[in-house]
Amino acid sequence: CRTSECCFQDPPYPDADSGSASGPRDLRCYRISSDRYECSWQYEGPTAGVSHFLRCCLSSGRCCYFAAGSATRLQFSDQAGVSVLYTVTLWVESWARNQTEKSPEVTLQLYNSVKYEPPLGDIKVSKLAGQLRMEWETPDNQVGAEVQFRHRTPSSPWKLGDCGPQDDDTESCLCPLEMNVAQEFQLRRRQLGSQGSSWSKWSSPVCVPPENPPQPQVRFSVEQLGQDGRRRLTLKEQPTQLELPEGCQGLAPGTEVTYRLQLHMLSCPCKAKATRTLHLGKMPYLSGAAYNVAVISSNQFGPGLNQTWHIPADTHTEPVALNISVGTNGTTMYWPARAQSMTYCIEWQPVGQDGGLATCSLTAPQDPDPAGMATYSWSRESGAMGQEKCYYITIFASAHPEKLTLWSTVLSTYHFGGNASAAGTPHHVSVKNHSLDSVSVDWAPSLLSTCPGVLKEYVVRCRDEDSKQVSEHPVQPTETQVTLSGLRAGVAYTVQVRADTAWLRGVWSQPQRFSIEVQVSD
């Protein structure tokens, strides 16, 4: 037989299929020009010493073969003895290691069998009613195709599916969408309506994320507040990355999960903007305010579930940094200014009440005064911190108040509101004899003592009603008792107690009269 012809003789090897797992497969035959044809196939297994034979049986029942040697592609003309206008059955037999391995058969009409391409270029993926929709441009001059897909997950083998007939300049396929695992898809096409035409190769992998992006498994920690009034937020664990099917490992566009940080500043509710989405790669520095932080995972189908953490406010207080002067027109606060043109947010809330009850005020941008101080004033009519109770005050600063990540904490402290000097007056002052020339003075703690750092000291005043001499005794804010000594028997005294803050002298308590009785010896 001539090498260019199909040889109508018995092939030069015994006719027996070994049935082994290796061997020829994926036989494709098609017309490549007006009079030339090509068949190609894959061979699975060791290729050394393998000889391939393309077998062909005509509709008459006569069969022939082409010897391809070690090649897995063979071309022939319409003069090679194979009927191209009528249906033929083709398969490959591979002779190796004294055994024959056979491919599955294809039955087709060679003249009408055109080589079809798989979807080429960009395959657009979208979600449609809980399913996956893939769409692509039909390859040139190949309108009219049957399309199949195969898909697998990281833990499952390939499954075959059908896209149905296509007859347009764009082709599409509806495929199953997995909720929680990534999938790899491949598509192939063959000529529509051409009986037994060969399938194209499989397309390049299309990698598809799960409908729900993986929920991030992360924890946050927050550092101590620095001298600049900011603290670093750090991520303790990186978000889990998606497990990918084999063909999607490495660079797999389409399956990327993007993690973002959503920051919600709970403190200072009167500021312009309360939330901001940030990159996980650029972890922010935060003020000492309270925040909610959420990690949002999203893929090409949109955002998934998020996890939210609460970052409590930094409660470190600096009792001396804030100066408060109360005048007839109202109250003014002074504190060390941060920089030029700063906006300050002053937030206050009654101690012991829910954080949601905080009130705040935003200043206009201000420069430091000649003493380097920033100020905030309010009138009595405004009602701000007007009740006689303890308030927790925090002052935040920003040169860009509309930018959430640029706020810093200036100070946190306590302040007793309303008429603190009167409200703080100690009550229930009592005097008890202590010795022949001394007494013990006790009183109930001032209301100011409920406000950390506000009560600077108690002052006990003792007045000799005879000589009108007055002595004053400072007492630590933690004490509610003092011993007055050097007193004379039979003399009338009055004692009063007041509670002072750093900026305000208290109001004296009601005078309490006492005397030490003269001791008469028997």
Epitope: D228, E256, T258, T277, H279, L280, Y285, A339
Partner: antibody, heavy 117, light 110 residues
């Protein structure tokens, strides 16, 4: 007035080194993240490097990774770019830029780096 | 080759409106904020739009920004000769952990 002023550019041979500086004034430098961006003659902007306010997070473009080093000295209100193993393609106008939440709101006037033998 | 794609040039007559597009992917524009910069001839870039559609103080409301999916658009109405400049879009790319710019668009006012 908020201002950034770059310096340190010049002519250098391939394989040589340069250190660019950026002096900041008119704002609290230590609170802001900073970037270097370059522009080759007649070309577009190319981001080079990012450093956060306390130098704890740094990023580089692939084109300069391993050759360039960004740093800052908050006490001196200064940003730096150490450029080693310079190549012809590093020839550009180099800008430093202040970043606020993903946008570069203040830019310097740039300093020119020419790499040529 | 820029990560973000912009048209090389656009032109329009004074008083007209023009739009400049910027397209990217889910790892940059799709999930991050977009900024627009104006670079007048011989000067440093200047921030024009931040957070997709916000204008810094001093930028006239003739300039606007928008974002949809993985694309962003800069709009300029009432064109003036002084608007002739190069315009760049910029954002962060979460996959690259890098800043990215478009190739720039030269605006000519006819």
């Amino acid at each position: 007035e908020v201002q950034l002023v770059e310096s340190g550019g010049g002519l250098v041979q391939p394989g040589g080194s340069l250190r660019l500086s950026c002096a900041a004034s008119g704002f609290t430098f230590s609170s802001y993240d900073m970037n270097w961006v370059r522009q080759a003659p007649g070309k577009g902007l190319e981001w080079i490097s990012y450093i956060n306010s306390r130098s704890s997070t740094i990023y580089y473009a692939d084109s300069v990774k391993g050759r360039f080093t960004i740093s800052r000295d908050n006490a001196k209100n200064s940003l730096y770019l150490q450029m080693n193993s310079l190549r012809d393609e590093d020839t550009a106008l180099y800008y430093c830029a202040r970043e606020i939440e993903d946008s570069m709101d203040v830019w310097g006037q740039g300093t020119t780096v020419t790499v040529s033998s | 080759q820029s990560v973000l794609t912009q048209p090389p040039s656009v032109s329009a007559a004074p008083g007209q409106k023009v739009t400049i597009s910027c397209s990217g992917s889910s790892s940059n524009i799709g999930n991050n904020y977009v900024s627009w910069y104006q670079q007048l001839p011989g000067t440093a870039p200047k921030l024009l739009i931040y957070d997709n559609n916000e204008r810094p103080s001093g930028i006239p409301d003739r300039f606007s920004g928008s974002k949809s999916g993985t694309s962003a658009t800069l709009g300029i109405t009432g064109l003036q000769p002084g608007d002739e400049a190069d315009y760049y879009c910029g954002t962060w790319d979460s996959s690259l952990s890098a800043g990215v710019f478009g190739g720039g668009t030269k605006l000519t006012v006819l």
